[in-house]
Amino acid sequence: CKAMHVAQPAVVLASSRGIASFVCEYASPGKATEVRVTVLRQADSQVTEVCAATYMMGNELTFLDDSICTGTSSGNQVNLTIQGLRAMDTGLYICKVELMYPPPYYLGIGNGTQIYVIDPEPCPDSDF
C-alpha cells in the first residue's frame, strides 16, 4: 500500500552554531486537523526519536520544553529546526508524519535528510 508521501531535502549542512533547518512536506489524502510530526535519527541500524510534536492545522508546533527541535507549520509543510548539534550528531534525520484527527489515520515517512555537522575549530589563543 502506498503510504502518504512525505518529502524532505536529501542533504542539509548544519551551521557553525550547530543549527540545521529543513522543510518536511506531506501530501495529505484527507482533511486532517490534528497532525503529529516526529523526527527520527538513523545511524548505522539504530533509529532513535529526536523529537515529536502534535499540532492543530493553522497553529504552531509545540515541542516539549527540553526539546532540541522547534518548528512552524504552513499548510502541508512543516519547517523544522534542530539545534545543539555536534559532529557526532551527523546522520540521517527522518521526518514521520501522522494524520491523527479526524479519521482516517494516515502515516507517511520521508526518505530522510542527511545532516552534516562540523564542529567549529577552536579559536587560536591570541597573544597581546
Epitope: 500500500c1 503510504a3 502518504m4 489524502p29 484527507g30 482533511k31 516526529t38 527520527l40 538513523q42 541500524s45 533509529v47 527522518i94 514521520k96 501522522e98 494524520l99 479519521p103 482516517p104 489515520y105 494516515y106 502515516l107 515517512i109
Partner: antibody, heavy 116, light 106 residues
Framework: QVQLVQSGAEVKKPGASVKVSCKAS????????IHWVRQAPGQGLEWIGY????????DYNQKFKSRATLTVDNSISTAYMELSRLRSDDTAVYYC?????????WGQGTLVTVSS | DIQMTQSPSSLSASVGDRVTITCGAS??????LNWYQRKPGKAPKLLIY???NLADGVPSRFSGSGSGRDYTLTISSLQPEDFATYFC????????FGGGTKVEIK
C-alpha cells in the same frame, strides 16, 4: 452507525472469476479507502489491495495485481473486488474494510470456495 | 515484502493475567504497525494503530509499544472477552500481517 455489508458466499470452478461486493453506510463513502483482505483456511490474513473512492486510485499487492480488479460505484456507496483465473488455493474468506492506514471497520466476510 | 514474525503463536492465560504478544519486522518499519483482534466467525477489530495509539472504543487495558523492528501488544489484565486471536500488521510498502497469536483459557 458505520456498516460494511458484503455479498453472499460463492462457489466457483477453477479458472472462473468471482465478484464480491461491499456496500457501505453510516459515513461519507469517498472519505475512506476500501481495502480488501483475505484469509484462507488455516492461514493468516493477506492484504489484496485498496481503492480510494474519492479519486478512483488503487494499489495492489503485487501477488494479486494480474488477477484482482478493484472498482467502486460511488452513487450506491459500493466497492467491488473481482478475482479472475481462480485456483483452489483462492478458497478463502474475503473481507472489505474501510480505512486510511488502519482498517477500523470491516465487512462480515464472504466465503469463496473454488472447487471442481 | 516486509515479513512480520509474531510470537508466541498461542498462549494459555487466566482472567486477570498480564499478557504480552510480540511482533518482529524483517526491517525497520518506523512505528508503522497496527494490531487487530479476531474472534471466531467475526471480522477483525482494530485495537492499536501507529504502534501506540488506542483505537476508538478499545478498553485502556490494551496498549501498544515498540519502535524500529520490535513491537509489543500488552493486555494489562485479561478479561473473558479477550480470548481471541491477535494479529499485527505492517503498513509500510506492501501491507503484511503476522501469523497471529491465539490467546486461550488456561
Amino acid at each position: 452507525q458505520v456498516q460494511l455489508v458484503q455479498s453472499g458466499a460463492e462457489v466457483k470452478k477453477p479458472g472462473a472469476s468471482v465478484k464480491v461486493s461491499c456496500k457501505a453506510s453510516g459515513y461519507t463513502f469517498t472519505d475512506y479507502k476500501i481495502h480488501w483482505v483475505r484469509q484462507a483456511p488455516g492461514q493468516g490474513l493477506e492484504w489484496i489491495g485498496y481503492i480510494y473512492p474519492y479519486s478512483g486510485s488503487s494499489d495492489y499487492n503485487q501477488k494479486f495485481k494480474s488477477r484482482a480488479t478493484l472498482t467502486v460505484d460511488n452513487s450506491i456507496s459500493t466497492a467491488y473486488m473481482e478475482l479472475s483465473r481462480l485456483r483452489s488455493d483462492d478458497t478463502a474468506v474475503y473481507y472489505c474494510a474501510r480505512g486510511g492506514d488502519a482498517m477500523d471497520y470491516w465487512g462480515q466476510g464472504t466465503l469463496v470456495t473454488v472447487s471442481s | 515484502d516486509i515479513q512480520m514474525t509474531q510470537s508466541p503463536s498461542s498462549l494459555s492465560a487466566s482472567v486477570g493475567d498480564r499478557v504480552t504478544i510480540t511482533c518482529g519486522a524483517s526491517e525497520n518499519i518506523y512505528g508503522a504497525l497496527n494490531w487487530y483482534q479476531r474472534k471466531p466467525g467475526k471480522a477483525p477489530k482494530l485495537l492499536i494503530y501507529g504502534a501506540t495509539n488506542l483505537a476508538d472504543g478499545v478498553p485502556s487495558r490494551f496498549s501498544g509499544s515498540g519502535s524500529g523492528r520490535d513491537y509489543t501488544l500488552t493486555i494489562s489484565s485479561l478479561q473473558p472477552e479477550d480470548f481471541a486471536t491477535y494479529f499485527c500488521q505492517n503498513i509500510l510498502g506492501t501491507w503484511t500481517f503476522g501469523g497471529g497469536t491465539k490467546v486461550e483459557i488456561k
